[in-house]
Amino acid sequence: YNVFPRTLKWSQTNLTYRIVNYTPDISHSEVEKAFRKAFKVWSDVTPLNFTRIHDGTADIMISFGTKEHGDFYPFDGPSGLLAHAFPPGPNLGGDAHFDDDETWTSSSKGYNLFIVAAHELGHSLGLDHSKDPGALMFPIYTYTGKSHFMLPDDDVQGIQSLYGPGDEDPNPKHPKTPEKCDPALSLDAITSLRGETMIFKDRFFWRLHPQQVEPELFLTKSFWPELPNHVDAAYEHPSRDLMFIFRGRKFWALNGYDIMEGYPRKISDLGFPKEVKRLSAAVHFEDTGKTLFFSGNHVWSYDDANQTMDKDYPRLIEEEFPGIGDKVDAVYEKNGYIYFFNGPIQFEYSIWSNRIVRVMPTNSLLWC
């Protein structure tokens, strides 16, 4: 997290806000609800109290405007700048302005007013942008999904560094951003994508370029807003320029940033019995047209050419790949080796000699 220079903060804990005008995109009540929820995000974790007033001057004046709107920081038309807010202080201090050339919504379409408002109010209370891609105060808009919003831990630490904690946090689970060099790091899924390596963990993935030691961390939804937050398994089909993502009983085919028509589909379409509720890992072999799927302690082999599961499968993982354990969290193939991830350990398995040749920490994939 980052606070503003000179640690600008409100000296009082009881603050007022006023919605000066409204966007035509959604109803007045939806606008009011978005701001009420956005203030609650911050009051839940601090001693701050927010009261709405209907006229006069409030500490935090909220308004919608376009282009030049009275503060010498003009908006820029659709997309680009969405909103801005001023740090705590008199006059413009604390005020939040929203660009009415955007399409404001209460859903995943356009820009979700609640998410943008919660971010802007962070500025109104004294938080600058964060470098943590998982933080609400990260400077890139990402719609986080329909389920109950949880303020990330980085933002909690930031706001509490200014105001301290509140009496009781009604939602004490604050998602943490994974640490790539955590010795206990386990992974959810790994796949290549157009020459890069994508390493999924929680609602994030690391993107690792070849010949590059420092992976970039992104929220999965910042690339693919329609995907679920968490991924069970993933693999690439390079010759078709597609990546497949699995979550629960559903799977998606992605071409770059775009979901292919007809997806998501059910994993039962691939031949999985109904007892299989989720996959844990997948890896595709371009030269043979086979894809291995892992679920529980079993492995399946799918044949691209016939579009069916190979007979004699499923088989026990321990029989097919002795020594790697009875589960696979994530898997990928490179240069004739399969890399199996099981908790904090990865196994380098030679396809040619059919045996484990190296055991390494999981986080060594991320150059730790």
């Epitope: 659709p78 997309s79 890139i140 808009y141 990402t142 992104f218 910042s222 690339f223 320029d241 071409n255 770059g256 940033y257 775009d258 292919m260 028509e261």
Partner: nanobody, 114 residues
Framework: EVQLVESGGGSVQAGGSLRLSCAAS????????MNWYRQAPGKQREFVAG???????NYAVSVRGRFTISRDNAEGTGYLQMNSLKPEDTAVYYC????????WGLGTQVTVSS
């Protein structure tokens, strides 16, 4: 419906630069990812670079560090700045909106001679 028209192709010496443009008609351009693909004679069409609605970029390994993709939603235009061009970059370059099942331009020829 989005129509795409590429321009900016041509012939250049190895080490030179070109800037390709992709003009989109239709006001929905900003709702789609924007991508560049290329096809060399006798080869499959291959991905070159992409930029998401949220302006996150993605490059083929062979062009990373040399090519830069960008977009101007207000003007409905996408760009591919190509520096340090190599003879193996010779191909017809296609602009795409919305991925493989999306919208395609007719292409612009880029020829790099040694």
């Amino acid at each position: 419906e989005v129509q795409l028209v590429e321009s900016g192709g041509g012939s250049v010496q190895a080490g030179g630069s070109l800037r390709l443009s992709c003009a989109a008609s239709g006001s929905t351009f900003s709702r789609y990812s924007m991508n560049w693909y290329r096809q060399a004679p006798g080869k499959q069409r291959e991905f070159v670079a992409g930029i998401s609605v949220g302006r996150i970029t993605n490059y083929a390994v062979s062009v990373r560090g040399r090519f830069t993709i960008s977009r101007d939603n207000a003007e409905g235009t996408g760009y591919l700045q190509m520096n340090s061009l190599k003879p193996e970059d010779t191909a017809v370059y296609y602009c795409n909106a919305g991925g493989l099942q999306g919208y395609w331009g007719l292409g612009t020829q880029v020829t790099v001679s040694s």
